[in-house]
């Protein structure tokens, strides 16, 4: 009889442990749900607020007309600069006009002073022809002033108010460009 009682007591204790475990699991699950809910709410809020006051350019980007520009705070070679821009959904700066060149050089003067900044311009090794990274040719007034003597790949960069050329493997700051978001209002 005593053995029977102790067996029942052990079974009850085991049941209790299982229920405690289940309760713990449920509490954990509830907490996880609450966290996920919080995350979702925050994400939605974030999306909604950015939709409401959708500024045409991301934070730390500069706007001019239909474009947004990002001036890097790190140095890299031309190829890595291009990669860094692509990760942001942008490309290296492509200067389409003298007005755009003036805006860029004016902005750089205010931000950083006279440094070198890679742009999306490179020279074809065989023909020596300059091309923007989208395959188009620069207008005659926007060709690099000096021809680099490098046997390696040659790329374009902006310094002060000039467009110059250098070995693509040298380290410089860089400028990314993307289209500004159109206001739907």
């Amino acid at each position: 009889k005593l053995l029977q009682v102790s067996t029942i007591a052990m079974q009850q204790q085991e049941k209790l442990i299982q229920q405690e475990r289940a309760l713990l699991n449920f509490t954990e699950w509830k907490r996880s749900c609450a966290l996920q809910m919080k995350y979702c709410q925050a994400f939605m809020q974030n999306s909604l607020s950015s939709a409401h006051n959708s500024s045409p350019c991301p934070n730390n980007w500069i706007q001019n007309r239909e474009s947004c520009y990002y001036v890097s705070e790190i140095w890299s070679i031309w190829h890595t600069s291009q990669e860094n821009c692509l990760k942001e959904g942008s490309t290296l700066l492509q200067i389409e006009s003298k007005e755009e060149m003036d805006f860029i050089t004016g902005s750089l003067r205010k931000i950083k002073g006279s440094y070198d900044y890679w742009v999306g311009l490179s020279q074809d090794g065989h023909s020596g022809r300059w091309l923007w990274q989208d395959g188009s040719s620069p207008s005659p007034g926007l060709l690099p002033a000096e021809r680099s003597q490098s046997a390696n790949q040659v790329c374009g960069y902006v310094k002060s108010n000039s467009l110059l050329s250098s070995n693509c493997s040298t380290w410089k700051y860089f400028i990314c460009e993307k289209y500004a978001l159109r206001s739907s209002v």
Partner: nanobody
Framework: QVQLQESGGGLVQPGGSLRLSCLAS????????MGWYRQAPGKERELVAA???????AYGIAVNGRFTISRDNAKNTVYLQMNSLKPEDTAVYYC???????????????WGQGTQVTVSS
Amino acid sequence: QVQLQESGGGLVQPGGSLRLSCLASRSFSSFNAMGWYRQAPGKERELVAAITNGGRIAYGIAVNGRFTISRDNAKNTVYLQMNSLKPEDTAVYYCNAKPTPVYGSTVGDYWGQGTQVTVSS
């Protein structure tokens, strides 16, 4: 997880053309950019061409003026038209997608399995 399925590689003579396709398992809107990279034996992987979600295009220096990248949003497919192919274009071509970061998270690039392009007479 995102799947990128390349097709269109093969053997072609110098001066010939090929068109590569990359089908993504997710909508383009979830990527900051999509494009093509290549790796030749003993060389580093290099950018061939990319297109951003805003439609901006970037070509690698070696192919600028010969290759054309395009996309079909409805089909979730990005194409690479390769003209005037040279023996030095021989490589494995990889499709690449750069995800748009979600709420501060950083996710690495997605890569396809690669398709072999051989330019030889």
